[in-house]
């Protein structure tokens, strides 16, 4: 009566501060509307990174000022988080909710540890 959600254990952000991972859920029903939320857990503090509700077969739409983008394919959501800095290193948890039609189902992944390493500043060049 609950939904299983799978996501990778570890992801390393690119030097440009971009991290991507797949959040996959085993839908117990034929949902037409799904909500995906990314939560960040660090030092027992939880913050909502971003959230999007989408109709099956349509694209995810995050708010304009969101640091997340994503695409969906069946029961898979490909999430990309941008603008990450070293201080954003933490556990990023995928929460999936089947919103419509009833019944509602909730699924929470075990989290993806995203490591972010700030790039070294370019040394001054002497010519």
């Amino acid at each position: 009566k609950a939904m299983h959600v799978a996501q990778p254990a570890v992801v390393l952000a690119s030097s440009r501060g971009i991290a991507s991972f797949v959040c996959e859920y085993a839908s117990p029903g034929k949902a037409t509307e799904v909500r995906v939320t990314v939560l960040r857990q660090a030092d027992s503090q939880v913050t909502e990174v971003c959230a999007a509700t989408y109709m099956m077969g349509n694209e995810l739409t995050f708010l304009d000022d969101s640091i997340c983008t994503g695409t969906s394919s069946g029961n898979q959501v490909n999430l990309t988080i941008q603008g990450l800095r070293a201080m954003d290193t933490g556990l990023y948890i995928c929460k999936v909710e089947l919103m419509y039609p009833p019944p509602y189902y909730l699924g929470i992944g075990n989290g993806t540890q995203i490591y972010v390493i700030d790039p070294e500043p370019c040394p001054d060049s002497d010519f």
């Epitope: 939880v46 419509y100 019944p103 909730l106």
Partner: antibody, heavy 119, light 108 residues
Framework: QVQLVESGGGVVQPGRSLRLSCAAS????????MHWVRQAPGKGLEWVAV????????HYADSVEGRFTLSRDNSKNTLYLQMNSLRAEDTAVYYC????????????WGQGTLVTVSS | EIVLTQSPGTLSLSPGERATLSCRAS???????LAWYQQKPGQAPRLLIY???SRATGIPDRFSGSGSGTDFTLTISRLEPEDFAVYYC?????????FGPGTKVDIK
Amino acid sequence: QVQLVESGGGVVQPGRSLRLSCAASGFTLSNYGMHWVRQAPGKGLEWVAVIWYDGRNKHYADSVEGRFTLSRDNSKNTLYLQMNSLRAEDTAVYYCARGGVWGSYFDYWGQGTLVTVSS
Amino acid sequence: EIVLTQSPGTLSLSPGERATLSCRASQSVSSSYLAWYQQKPGQAPRLLIYGSSSRATGIPDRFSGSGSGTDFTLTISRLEPEDFAVYYCQHYGSSPFTFGPGTKVDIK
């Protein structure tokens, strides 16, 4: 700090209607699932209904489906429960409760408002 | 619909004793989606535990939750006078979000 305050309870005859309000402060309603839970006198807790996030999706317990309707006024940060065709078995204290970050457990509750359905 | 059964119905104990409350589900419930509440007469319920074992903000560490599948337990390691109340379990993995009938912990 988070606060939920219910109002609108009272005595009503069977078959009549009543509207309950839940004024929220300290957070934004649209970021959470907002629930109503009721408790008949001397009985346990019964989940009644939820309105989700943007307010488009609502789910109801079978016992109230088709009779109760949830709505929300974002400008007032207030939740409403419209109760129609009331029955004696709807007599209860009605609590407004906020769903948690990790799911629909209820991390904050109002003080409750008593609805008595009696002729 | 998941049906939750709580036992015992009433638990009579003295302050300082250990209380063990049981919640059994009619079908398997992920441990991530089970909560416990405390309710005192005339008051709204108060969240104690969510996710089967995570204590809510401000809840003392004498309260602990455990379990998986269909069997869950709330333990109060040493009962304080303010702990005598009714305790409810609740699942929230899917709707409807049902509660157990409650266990009353009273003073022996």
